[in-house]
């Protein structure tokens, strides 16, 4: 999906109002220094591409974050503010819902969510630079 035509201001508002709180709740008990940020992004569409990938694409050591509250809110936000996102992406993530068996917050998942927080912060920074 090409995130170029998204309403970035509205996405930022949703992130600051609600998604960020859920990400921080997920990370509770860990320190910001526990993980190194290895994933980066260069502009707003690129940041959203990386956020989409890290949130919804399962990895071997963190099967799926897609059922977490922050992920559901991310999906809702992208559906609202990125025209065409729903049609191209929602069906693709339904299979991941089914793949998830039990809710286990592994260290790898915490690391992945730490990367997500970094990407979101980068998204906000690139937004501020443009204004």
């Amino acid at each position: 999906y090409d995130f170029t035509n998204c309403d970035f201001q509205k996405i930022e508002a949703d992130y600051l109002r609600t998604i960020s709180k859920d990400l921080i709740t997920y990370m509770s008990g860990t320190k910001s220094t526990d993980f190194n940020n290895t994933v980066s992004c260069s502009n707003r569409p690129h940041c959203l591409t990386e956020i989409q990938s890290l949130t919804f694409n399962p990895t071997p050591r963190c099967a799926s974050l897609a059922k977490e509250m922050f992920a559901r809110k991310t999906k809702a936000t992208l559906a609202l503010w990125c025209p065409g996102y729903s049609e191209t992406q929602i069906n693709a993530t339904q299979a991941m819902k089914k793949a998830r068996k039990s809710k286990v917050t592994t260290n790898k998942c915490l690391e992945q969510v730490s990367q997500l927080l970094g990407l979101w912060r980068r998204f906000i920074r690139t937004l501020l630079k443009k204004q």
Partner: antibody, heavy 120, light 111 residues
Framework: QVQLVQSGAEVKKPGSSVKVSCKAS????????ISWVRQAPGQGLEWLGV????????IYAEKFQGRVTITADTSTSTAYMELSSLRSEDTAVYYC?????????????WGQGTLVTVSS | QSALTQPPSASGSPGQSVTISCTGT?????????VSWYQQHPGKAPKLMIY???KRPSGVPDRFSGSKSGNTASLTVSGLQAEDEADYYC???????????FGGGTKLTVL
Amino acid sequence: QVQLVQSGAEVKKPGSSVKVSCKASGFTFGSYGISWVRQAPGQGLEWLGVIVPLVGVTIYAEKFQGRVTITADTSTSTAYMELSSLRSEDTAVYYCARGQEYFYWYFDLWGQGTLVTVSS
Amino acid sequence: QSALTQPPSASGSPGQSVTISCTGTSSDIGGYNRVSWYQQHPGKAPKLMIYEFNKRPSGVPDRFSGSKSGNTASLTVSGLQAEDEADYYCSSYAGTDIFVLFGGGTKLTVL
């Protein structure tokens, strides 16, 4: 069962406000969009706005901006639509409608409608 | 933010096919595949018949079909039946600011 149940008919004076409720049951309220659509007597459908409780987003039709307020109480699975500064042209049946999960612009479930009459 | 344009009326005999058009702009119908159609019988709430311009929700007969070309969407009802007599409304997503637009409605009469 899966349904939206709206509050009863209202008669209001011009200049006053009306608040209509819409109670959801049989589905996860917060995940869907709840839109409000009105229909004046003998007229077509007109969209007023939507709320997506999951992310606390509301979007209003430009025509009603500043006059309509849509809220939701997830603890009771109830959405509300308040319209202020009522005039006779606001006499209509007001429907709440469920927007599909992540496809908030398709209304696959409707309330029974609430008739709001504005008359002096 | 004007409504989508539909013919006020359409008619057909039982067993025939009838097509209702809905014309918008490149900012709504032409810009997205997010067109839906609703059926409304007198005194009743609308019912979703078509979404994503050509998909049918479960329970909607396959006599109802949707299509789209450019800025115009169409609803075709084939094998008309008496119970198809109703008002039909098209709707389109219209971007993140306007969100949803409805057509003025078409009264379908089964002769």
